[in-house]
């Protein structure tokens, strides 16, 4: 994968894709974050590895994306969950899996859900399971707004760059 | 569907939507491909039919999309799978379904997974099943990069223009 | 806007690519609609509440989005379905859930499916269920085209702004 076996600075350079010159007026804020695979029981977003990036003003603060300038953004996220069969001795309890992108804005004193997906899974004997959730939509956001995620079922996440991600771009 | 019952050239014309102007600097490469429904045991991408198109430099080579110019692209794909119940005499074995968008770049000597979705299906008696997978995200790509897909469960694809597709557009 | 204030020949040139002529270059048609939670057995789209909006020429007509100007649009929609376990006295019949974005243009005497997702659900005893469907793609659309949705399983929709939505934006 990008940067594998490179020094951090070389890996960074390896991700600097050749780009077209843009006048300031056509800056296109964009971000693509991936779930940190080294953190198994939490979902920490990273932009400094693999195919992830922060461009034209996006930044990461307290595991949230900070909106660089007011406007309309397409915001998206995906998670993939997996699990093993339950052991015959254990009780099979249903698993509630959910993933949500939330907005925290100075306008509201709470997190507003923007995108929500949900699933109930009933693990069976000898039956490993896999489930993917994706969502994305356009939202009017304000400079300084914070975009974050909330996930139920974090221990079941399949943490890889192509399965668990979170991003946004200005329209 | 668009162009049905038309000659190839008339069908082509039928897809020429009235369009607006851009200076060359603001060309917007975009592509939307659909799975060829006449190929039942493979997934062949087509751009010359129905609602599919290649615009402003995108091209198709060896079933891959060729990135026309370096920059950030939103890349997406969907598949829908279906299956019948297993016969009482047959053993019901779990089915692993997966769909992945991959990047092949001169930078790396292998296919890099960009987007992956997965599902385990356990066919039951008298129980036909259906499953949809969608994913999309923003990636920094380089001119000449090749975007392709890999699918597990191809014989189960529901091949229609609205269910199985693959596309990208420059941001 | 296309051709505004241009000579006929310049206006002609101005239509070679799907984009607005950049006199009003900052026009970016976009729409995000949410399912009206007060209408439990139908799916009525609203743009005048919560995070929903219509921008730069998008409009509603008979529960459809009207395309404001010819060009390429990214169109997306999501639904979330839920259901309770069936009662032991009742027969558990399979539920067919589907969600489709359709294009109506009098070019064709029917609605053309653009995006389709489908699922079969088999409710079990004591087993509440939840299922999410999302899809989106880029399409060449014409001014005045009508984008609508068709859903199987409407009584099972989880109607909230973050779970059931429909939108589009010009590329």
């Amino acid at each position: 994968l990008p940067g594998v076996g490179l020094t951090p600075s070389a890996a960074q350079t390896a991700r600097q894709h050749p780009k077209m010159h843009l006048a300031h007026s056509t800056l296109k804020p964009a971000a693509h974050l991936i779930g940190d695979p080294s953190k198994q029981n939490s979902l920490l977003w990273r932009a400094n590895t693999d195919r992830a990036f922060l461009q034209d003003g996006f930044s990461l603060s307290n595991n949230s994306l900070l909106v660089p300038t007011s406007g309309i953004y397409f915001v998206y996220s995906q998670v993939v969950f997996s699990g093993k069969a339950y052991s015959p001795k254990a009780t099979s309890s249903p698993l509630y899996l959910a993933h949500e992108v939330q907005l925290f804005s100075s306008q509201y004193p709470f997190h507003v859900p923007l995108l929500s997906s949900q699933k109930m899974v009933y693990p069976g004997l000898q039956e490993p399971w896999l489930h993917s959730m994706y969502h994305g939509a356009a939202f009017q956001l304000t400079q300084g707004d914070q975009l974050s995620t909330h996930t139920d079922g974090i221990p079941h996440l399949v943490l890889s760059p192509s399965t668990v991600f979170f991003g946004a771009f200005a329209l | 569907l668009p162009g049905v019952g038309l000659t190839p050239s008339a069908a082509q014309t039928a897809r020429q939507h009235p369009k607006m102007h851009l200076a060359h600097s603001t060309l917007k490469p975009a592509a939307h491909l659909i799975g060829d429904p006449s190929k039942q045991n493979s997934l062949l991408w087509r751009a010359n039919t129905d609602r599919a198109f290649l615009q402003d430099g995108f091209s198709l080579s060896n079933n891959s999309l060729l990135v026309p110019t370096s920059g950030i692209y939103f890349v997406y794909s969907q598949v829908v799978f279906s299956g019948k119940a297993y016969s009482p005499k047959a053993t019901s074995s779990p089915l692993y379904l997966a769909h992945e968008v991959q990047l092949f770049s001169s930078q790396y000597p292998f296919h890099v997974p960009l987007l992956s979705s997965q599902k385990m299906v356990y066919p039951g008696l008298q129980e036909p099943w259906l499953h949809s997978m969608y994913h999309g995200a923003a990636f920094q790509l380089t001119q000449g990069d090749q975007l392709s897909t890999h699918t597990d469960g191809i014989p189960h694809l529901v091949l229609s223009p609205s269910t199985v597709f693959f596309g990208a557009f420059a941001l | 806007l296309p051709g505004v204030g241009l000579t006929p020949s310049a206006a002609q040139t101005a239509r070679q690519h799907p984009k607005m002529h950049l006199a009003h270059s900052t026009l970016k048609p976009a729409a995000h609609l949410i399912g009206d939670p007060s209408k439990q057995n139908s799916l009525l789209w609203r743009a005048n509440t919560d995070r929903a909006f219509l921008q730069d020429g998008f409009s509603l007509s008979n529960n459809s989005l009207l395309v404001p100007t010819s060009g390429i649009y990214f169109v997306y929609s999501q639904v979330v379905f839920s259901g309770k376990a069936y009662s032991p006295k009742a027969t558990s019949s399979p539920l067919y859930l589907a969600h489709e974005v359709q294009l109506f243009s009098s070019q064709y005497p029917f609605h053309v499916p653009l995006l389709s997702s489908q699922k079969m659900v088999y409710p079990g005893l004591q087993e509440p269920w939840l299922h999410s469907m999302y899809h989106g793609a880029a399409f060449q659309l014409t001014q005045g085209d009508q984008l609508s949705t068709h859903t199987d399983g409407i009584p099972h929709l989880v109607l909230s702004p973050s779970t059931v939505f429909f939108g589009a934006f010009a590329l």
Epitope: - | M20 | P2, A11, A47, N48, F53, G57, T142, G144
Partner: antibody, heavy 118, light 107 residues
């Protein structure tokens, strides 16, 4: 320069029909819809409907559905409004208009007066 | 259908005056409102779209504001050529209804 010229107005008997024409020039006819809007004497504006000459797509104000038909002829760069079962209250100046974005009526014809009277 | 109620129905003002016309929608229409100017015997002219954006060639003395249900057209300093009838229009959903008009007359 975008130009729209309506014709076909005049005196019509109640219960009769009218067919108005709108000749368009100065732009590519198939790139934009043509709207029809009417205005009764001394009254406000009322949208009738539109036709897209590219694909013959139409959309009507429910009030006029079944009585109005909007069409176009690409070869003549002309749009038409046909109205049937005319009544006195259909007396109005009828305008055709070309939008920029769909609902913004940016270019207008000069209007043609239709009088429904016996 | 959405009703658009304009006020006042007419007003008298002098050159140089600041004039404000309001329009109220019967339900929230986001910012999907346009304003037109019409002179006697002429077709209407688009002035403002998306509630607050001036159309090409419209003088800067014209401005629009509002969202939801309440919208305003303001002429900051009335000029002789501004005496006309002004219409608001909702473009949130068809049939894209117009207000009944506000006639701006010379005092």
């Amino acid at each position: 320069e975008v130009q729209l010229v309506e014709s076909g107005g005049g005196l019509v008997q109640p219960g009769g029909s009218l067919r108005l024409s709108c000749a368009a020039s100065g732009y590519t006819f198939t790139s934009y819809v043509i709207h029809w809007v009417r205005q009764a004497p001394g009254k406000g504006l009322e949208w009738v409907g539109y036709n897209n000459p590219y694909n013959d797509g139409t959309n009507y104000n429910e009030k006029f559905k079944g009585r109005a038909t909007i069409s176009s002829d690409k070869s003549k760069n002309t749009a038409y409004l046909q109205m049937n079962s005319l009544r006195a209250e259909d007396t109005a100046v009828y305008y055709c208009s070309r939008p920029t974005m769909l609902p913004w009526f940016a270019y207008w014809g000069q209007g043609t007066l239709v009088t429904v009277s016996s | 259908d959405i009703q658009m109620t304009q006020s006042p129905s007419s007003l008298s003002a002098s050159v140089g005056d600041r004039v404000t016309i309001t329009c109220r929608a019967s339900q929230a229409v986001s910012s999907a409102v346009a304003w037109y100017q019409q002179k006697p015997g002429k077709a209407p002219k688009l002035q403002i779209y998306s509630a607050s954006h001036r159309y090409t060639g419209v003088p800067s003395r014209f401005s629009g504001s509002g969202s939801g249900t309440d919208f305003t057209l303001t002429i900051s300093s009335l000029q002789p050529e501004d005496f006309a009838t002004y219409y608001c229009q909702e473009v949130y959903s068809t049939p894209w209804t117009f207000g009944q008009g506000t006639k701006v007359e010379i005092k």
